[in-house]
């Protein structure tokens, strides 16, 4: 009689996670009588997957009815495949005995599991960074197989190049993870900007997964300050304004100092947003010139988003002569804007605070 052959026709089978895998095995002869067993792996550490003769294997069913007369088909179906099921499966013929004796193994079928990557999660810096600085964003996705994967970063639709990406583990595994870091230069115009991490994988059928992060969570745009004096009023009061422009986020505290003494402190709230996502705020201070003998040094002090205060000072010249109604008071702008240019103008709406 010709020697029994155990035939596993497929060298490899690839299955999507969650699907069923069919592992085919036929024998060439009814002789000798004895059961078939399926194992994952070879050698002493192999794992029993299915034993026709005995045992409980809830996820495994025989493709062919084992009680069918003259059955020579010992293919099995494994349901609800997960990446942990990946490996090489062997169909092994045993000769009936007490105990049954291993006779011959098939060549093996490698089961690879196609598992989708998890939705990419993008995280930004723990604390805000000031515009014109570079920050890092990370993107993570897990649980995919096979290992080949493509990850791209975009800022406002433009691909980023300062990127470092790692896929782990480096060796063979049932599933893999990817972690990528992108370095992004923040600009003052980035309040409404977005970074996107895009992951492409064979399991996604050309429809990549995306994770996003808004730069508004990461950026701080410091304000420009400008202090100006309006015309003298009939009641000998001078109106001095402090224009705070183009800042983000809204968290801002403004303090007026007269000759170094705190005159008033205000907190910004419910400001309208500029088109670029920044905010403007104007604060007015009325100075009664007739109450002062000497020049008055006014300082607009702004503390933005917990950062060190920025000052802009302005001297109101008090003349020895009585003021003419409606005439300008001699004034000297002695302040410096420590962040940006004082002639930075903005046509967006201002939010005015009037103080009398």
């Amino acid at each position: 009689e010709e020697e029994l052959q155990v035939i596993q026709p497929e060298k490899s089978v690839s299955v999507a996670a969650g699907d069923s895998a069919t592992l085919n095995c036929t024998v060439s002869s009814l002789i000798p009588v004895g059961p078939i067993q399926w194992f994952r792996g070879a050698g002493p550490g192999r794992e029993l997957i299915y034993n026709l003769k005995e045992g409980h294997f809830p996820r495994v069913t025989a493709v062919s009815d084992p009680t069918k007369r003259n059955n020579m088909d010992f293919s099995i179906r494994i349901s609800n495949i997960t990446p942990a099921d990946a490996g090489t499966y062997y169909c092994v013929k045993f000769r009936k005995g007490s105990p049954d004796v291993e006779l011959k193994s098939g060549a093996g079928t490698e089961l690879s599991v196609r598992a989708k990557p998890s939705a990419p999660v993008v995280s930004g810096p723990a604390v805000r960074a000031t515009a014109e600085h570079t920050v890092s964003f990370t993107c993570e996705s897990h649980g995919f197989s096979p290992r080949d994967i493509t990850l791209k970063w975009f800022k406002n639709g433009n691909e980023l190049s300062d990127v470092q990406t790692n896929v782990d583990p480096a060796g063979k595994s049932v599933s893999y993870s990817i972690r990528s870091t992108a370095r992004v230069l923040l600009t003052r115009r980035d309040v409404h900007s977005q970074v996107i991490c895009e992951v492409a994988h064979v399991t996604l059928q050309g429809d990549p997964l995306r994770g996003t992060a808004n730069l508004s969570e990461a950026i701080r745009v410091p304000p420009f300050l400008e202090v100006t004096q309006q015309s003298m009023r009939a009641d000998n009061q001078v109106n001095v304004t402090c224009q705070v422009t183009k800042f983000y986020p809204q968290r801002l505290q403004l303090t007026w100092l007269e000759n170094g003494n705190v005159s008033r402190t205000e907190m910004a709230s419910a400001l309208p947003e500029n088109k670029d996502g920044t905010y403007n705020w104007t604060s007015w201070l009325l100075v009664n010139v007739s109450a002062h003998r000497d020049d008055v040094k006014l300082t607009c002090q702004v503390e933005h988003d917990g950062q060190p205060a920025v000052n802009k000072s302005f001297s109101v010249k008090v003349s020895a002569h009585p003021k003419e109604q409606g005439s300008n008071t001699a004034a000297e702008n002695t302040g410096t804007n420590e962040r940006g240019s004082s002639d930075y103008k903005d046509d967006d709406d201002k939010h005015h605070h009037h103080h009398h």
Epitope: P35, N51, L52, G55, P66, R69, N70, K96
Partner: antibody, heavy 119, light 110 residues
């Protein structure tokens, strides 16, 4: 290892019925046919019928079609054969046997139940 | 139905000699290259025991002095050399269709 356990004896009245049991162990009960065989004292073997425990498909020897009824209880891994309208001609040893190779053969046998029909 | 006829009904063989038992089917029991004949041994007070399957294949644990041969309709069980423990009744069975048994052959050891 494979075992088929059968009660040793059954004493029944003529005209009555008897339900013989065959409890299987040491293998997956639903994957192999169970056969029943009759042997009268000093006589040869007669094949009665077979049942597939997975779906209770049965095949009967025409001679026993109206005499024997095969059933299984998968929860207890037990095969049953009910013999009805018993006469002295039904006095015999009844064996259950498992078909391990799906060849309609009998690889493993129970020890048999001796049925005596007597008033 | 296929009828199996065994011969002889009984035979006595000296220890160490050859015992030959024949089984003839009323029609061929061969199919797809296999001969669906099985041989069983039964000792008094015991259930039968499978010796040979598919005409010529020794079951697990069966001594090599037992052998089976034949095809189509004519089959033979040989025991050589016969030993005392071989005293028993031997049955052939076919499974080409639904199973039937031959009438049995009683072997005595002289």
């Amino acid at each position: 290892q494979v075992q088929l356990q059968q009660p040793g004896t059954e004493l029944v009245r003529p005209g009555a019925s008897v339900k013989l049991s065959c409890k299987a162990s040491g293998y997956t009960f639903t994957n192999y046919w169970i056969n029943w065989v009759k042997q009268r004292p000093g006589q040869g073997l007669e094949w009665i019928a077979m049942i597939d425990p997975s779906d209770s498909e049965t095949h009967y020897n025409q001679i026993f079609k109206d005499k024997a009824t095969l059933t299984v209880d998968k929860s207890s891994n037990t095969a049953y054969m009910q013999l009805s309208s018993l006469t002295s001609g039904d006095s015999a040893v009844y064996y259950c046997a498992m078909d391990y190779g799906s060849l309609y053969a009998m690889d493993y046998w129970g020890r048999g139940t001796s049925v005596t029909v007597s008033s | 139905d296929i009828v199996l006829t065994q011969s002889p009904a009984s035979l006595a063989v000296s220890l160490g000699q050859r015992a030959t038992i024949s089984c003839r089917a009323s029609k061929s029991v061969s199919s797809s290259g296999y001969n669906y004949i099985f041989w069983y041994q039964q000792k008094p007070g015991q259930p039968p025991k499978l010796l040979i399957y598919l005409a010529s294949n020794l079951d697990s644990g069966v001594p090599a002095r037992f052998s089976g041969s034949g095809s189509g309709t004519d089959f033979t069980l040989n025991i050589h050399p016969v030993e005392e423990e071989d005293a028993a009744t031997y049955y052939c069975q076919h499974s080409r269709e639904l199973p039937t048994f031959g009438g049995g052959t009683k072997l005595e050891i002289k």
